[in-house]
Interface confidence: low
C-alpha cells in the first residue's frame, strides 16, 4: 500500500469483484499508519486520524490495529488487501461495514485488530461485545 500523501493524488475508480461476484470499488479509509492513542477501556473510539485516502487497489479494505504495552497505546489505520495477512493475521471480518475489534494473541502486548468495507469505517473502532456477528441486526446490515 502506498503512503497517504501519494495516495491522495490517485483518482481512479477501477473495480474488482469478490468471490461471490459482489462489485468492489476503491475504499475510502482513514490512513494515518501508527499514531499514539488515548483510546483505552472504552466501548468505542474515534481514530482521531485526519487523513482520508482512497485505497490504492480496488480490493483493499480499511483496517485498524490497537496495541497496548507497558509503555504506550497506539492505533494504526491503513488500507490492506484482505487476501493477504496483516501483522500475520487474516482479515476475517473484511466484509463488515463496521470495524469490530477482535483480540489477537501477541506476546508482550494487548493486540486488537478490525477490518471493514464501508467508507472510512476504520474511523470508529468498536470494542463492545454487543457488536459481534452473531447479532442478527448487524448481519442484516452486512448482507442487505
Amino acid at each position: 500500500t502506498i503512503p497517504p500523501h501519494v495516495q491522495k493524488s490517485v483518482n481512479n475508480d477501477m473495480i474488482v469483484t469478490d468471490n461471490n461476484g459482489a462489485v468492489k470499488f476503491p475504499q475510502l479509509c482513514k490512513f494515518c499508519d501508527v499514531r499514539f492513542s488515548t483510546c483505552d477501556n472504552q466501548k468505542s473510539c474515534m481514530s482521531n486520524c485526519s487523513i482520508t485516502s482512497i485505497c490504492e487497489k480496488p480490493q483493499e479494505v480499511c483496517v485498524a490495529v490497537w496495541r497496548k504495552n507497558d509503555e504506550n497505546i497506539t492505533l494504526e489505520t491503513v488500507c490492506h488487501d484482505p487476501k493477504l495477512p496483516y501483522h500475520d493475521f487474516i482479515l476475517e471480518d473484511a466484509a463488515s461495514p463496521k470495524c469490530i475489534m477482535k483480540e489477537k494473541k501477541k506476546p508482550g502486548e494487548t493486540f486488537f485488530m478490525c477490518s471493514c468495507s464501508s467508507d472510512e469505517c476504520n474511523d470508529n473502532i468498536i470494542f463492545s461485545e454487543e457488536y459481534n456477528t452473531s447479532n442478527p441486526d448487524l448481519l442484516l446490515v452486512i448482507f442487505q
Epitope: 491522495k8 483518482n11 481512479n12 475508480d13 477501477m14 473495480i15 469483484t17 459482489a22 462489485v23 468492489k24 470499488f25 475504499q27 475510502l28 482513514k30 485526519s50 487523513i51 482520508t52 485516502s53 482512497i54 461495514p97 468495507s117 464501508s118 467508507d119 472510512e120 469505517c121 474511523d123 442487505q144
Partner: antibody, heavy 122, light 107 residues
Framework: EVQLVESGGGLVQPGGSLRLSCAAS????????MTWVRQAPGKGLEWVSV????????YYADSVKGRFTISRDNSKNTLYLQMNSLRAEDTAVYYC???????????????WGQGTLVTVSS | DIQMTQSPSSLSASVGDRVTITCRAS??????LNWYQQKPGKAPKLLIY???SLQSGVPSRFSGSGSGTDFTLTISSLQPEDFATYYC?????????FGQGTKVEIK
C-alpha cells in the same frame, strides 16, 4: 426516510459566485460520501464532484476543477458546493446525491435531492 | 474519460410492451454499470446497479444484463408510470460518466 434538500440556486452573472447547500436527514450523514451531479436544461446528467464522509477526500470533474469546491459540515448534516468564476455552460439543475456506502452498489448514487437551478447569464 | 452511448435516444411504446434500451461503453467496464430513471422535473432514481442487481423497492419488471462494453435495460411489461428518461452510468473509472439518455414515450 432519507431526504436531501438543495438550496442556494439562482441567477448569477458570468464570473460570479454562488454557494449551494444540501440539507440531509434520515441517515447517518457523516459516514456517507456525497456527490454533486448537474443537468443542463434539456441535456443529460454530468457528475461534478464527490466528498468522503469526513470531508478528508474530494474529487472533481475536469470541467469544474479549480473553480468549484465541495465541502460538508457534519455537525449540521449539510453538504456544500462553492462555485466561483461561473460560466454560461455551468447553467444547470444541481443535484446532491448520496453515494451508496456499500461496495456491492458500485459507488452508485442511491438517493438524490430534488435539485436547485443555477442560471449563469448577463 | 469513458464515453457511454445509449440507443435509441427515444422510443415510442404502448402499455404492456416489452422495452429494451442498450448502453455501450467506449472501453470494457466489466459489469460496473448503473441504470437510472428520471421523470420530467424530478431527480433521477437508481433502478439497477452492478449491471443486473435490482435496487430495493424497484419493480421486478425492470432487469439489467450485460458485461464488458454492451449492456441492456429491459422493461418486461411497460406500465404507465414507466414513461420517463433512462440513463446508464459507468462506475469503472473517475469521472463516473453517464449515457445521453433514452426517452420512453407513449405511442
Amino acid at each position: 426516510e432519507v431526504q436531501l434538500v438543495e438550496s442556494g440556486g439562482g441567477l448569477v452573472q458570468p464570473g460570479g459566485s454562488l454557494r449551494l447547500s444540501c440539507a440531509a436527514s434520515g441517515f447517518d450523514f457523516d459516514i456517507y460520501a456525497m456527490t454533486w451531479v448537474r443537468q443542463a436544461p434539456g441535456k443529460g446528467l454530468e457528475w461534478v464532484s464527490v466528498i468522503s464522509g469526513s470531508g478528508g477526500t474530494t474529487y472533481y470533474a475536469d470541467s469544474v476543477k479549480g473553480r468549484f469546491t465541495i465541502s460538508r459540515d457534519n455537525s449540521k448534516n449539510t453538504l456544500y458546493l462553492q462555485m466561483n468564476s461561473l460560466r454560461a455552460e455551468d447553467t444547470a439543475v444541481y443535484y446532491c446525491a448520496r453515494r451508496s456506502q456499500y461496495r456491492d452498489k458500485v459507488g452508485a448514487t442511491d438517493y438524490w435531492g430534488q435539485g436547485t437551478l443555477v442560471t449563469v447569464s448577463s | 474519460d469513458i464515453q457511454m452511448t445509449q440507443s435509441p435516444s427515444s422510443l415510442s411504446a404502448s402499455v404492456g410492451d416489452r422495452v429494451t434500451i442498450t448502453c455501450r461503453a467506449s472501453q470494457s467496464i466489466s459489469s460496473y454499470l448503473n441504470w437510472y430513471q428520471q421523470k420530467p422535473g424530478k431527480a433521477p432514481k437508481l433502478l439497477i446497479y452492478a449491471a443486473s442487481s435490482l435496487q430495493s423497492g424497484v419493480p421486478s419488471r425492470f432487469s439489467g444484463s450485460g458485461s464488458g462494453t454492451d449492456f441492456t435495460l429491459t422493461i418486461s411489461s411497460l406500465q404507465p408510470e414507466d414513461f420517463a428518461t433512462y440513463y446508464c452510468q459507468q462506475s469503472y473509472s473517475t469521472p463516473p460518466t453517464f449515457g445521453q439518455g433514452t426517452k420512453v414515450e407513449i405511442k
